[in-house]
Amino acid sequence: LSTGVSFFFLSFHISNLQFNSSLEDPSTDYYQELQRDISEMFLQIYKQGGFLGLSNIKFRPG
Amino acid sequence: SVVVQLTLAFREGTINVHDVETQFNQYKTEAASRYNLTISDVSVSDVPFPFSAQSGAG
């Protein structure tokens, strides 16, 4: 069975940011800004075609 | 620091797991200057099919 889509799980640290409780709440400005920056960054990185998008963003303390 | 975890979706056959990681790692310097994000400890793995079928590419 093939979906025509490949999925990859990716994790990384952002060492110059501090985790706080607002990153547990998707309604906060901090969460939304970071999510927007990360989404935009991935569109830049994988702009060569084939990239369909990203999902399931989670933030955790490092 | 903040640990970020997410799922990336690509059209099947257009990229291998090595290039997903390599292309991300090669962008780290630009991420620091453009987004002020200092990225480290990058890890990439393929998602087993049963999970990927549920996760969508939203």
Epitope: - | E12, G13, N16, V17, H18, T22, Q26
Partner: antibody, heavy 120, light 107 residues
């Protein structure tokens, strides 16, 4: 037409180094990744590593990270592989091979091979 | 590292025979599987990529199939010029390992 022309056969003493070249023509050198593969006499193929001549990014098979260094000269459209601390087990034919362009996960063109013989 | 186990290591068949070579990966390589043909004293030549896509100029008697960890290369009607050693290669993750090869001979 695309061509990868490698330097000639070499005979080296144990402990010596050797630099093998791979001259590319017929395409834009900086837009294709160049890989190196070795084949010991009568044996199979073993992947050494690659260089992206556009960015000079290299990636090595861990087995060869202290054995080989890959470089590229954009102006000469030539890739190089230098092998260090040669031992008799390094006697092999060494190939350069071009990886196809975007989303092309295969080696579409190969050099003719360079035989490196290590013997005292 | 992903190990590629190729079988058989050698094979003798008659002209016109249907021949199948198999390659098993130690992990899922998601169809990033390549087949090469190497004739004695020559460089390898690309036959099949993405597990089943035949490269330009390769005769249609060659075909690739498989998915996940199991792949095969089939020659539907063996010809004298097919005498060679055939290698599979993992192109999913580094190191981009090769199978140990299958030496094909004519009976």
């Amino acid at each position: 037409q695309v061509q990868l022309v490698q330097s000639g056969a070499e005979v080296k003493k144990p402990g010596a180094s050797v630099k093998v070249s791979c001259k590319a023509s017929g395409y834009t050198f900086t837009t294709y990744t160049m890989h190196w593969i070795r084949q010991a006499p009568g044996q199979g193929l073993e992947w050494i590593g690659y260089i992206n001549p556009g960015s000079d990014y290299t990636h090595y098979n861990q087995k060869f990270k202290d054995k080989a260094t890959l470089t590229a000269d954009k102006s000469a459209s030539t890739a190089y592989m230098e092998l260090y601390s040669l031992r008799s087990e390094d006697t092999a034919v060494y190939y350069c091979a071009r990886q196809g362009n975007y989303a092309a996960y295969y080696f579409d063109y190969w050099g003719q091979g360079t035989l490196v013989t290590v013997s005292s | 590292d992903i190990q590629m186990t190729q079988s058989p290591s050698s094979l003798s068949a008659s002209v016109g025979d249907r021949v199948t070579i198999t390659c098993r990966a130690s992990g899922n390589i998601h169809n990033f599987l390549v087949w090469y043909q190497q004739k004695p004293g020559k460089s390898p030549k690309l036959l099949v990529y993405n597990a089943k896509t035949l490269t330009d100029g390769v005769p249609s008697r060659f075909s690739g199939s498989g998915s996940g960890t199991q792949y095969s290369l089939t020659i539907s009607s063996l010809q004298p010029e097919d005498v060679a050693t055939y290698y599979c290669q993992n192109f999913w993750n580094v190191p981009f390992t090769f199978g140990s090869g299958t030496k094909l001979e004519i009976k």
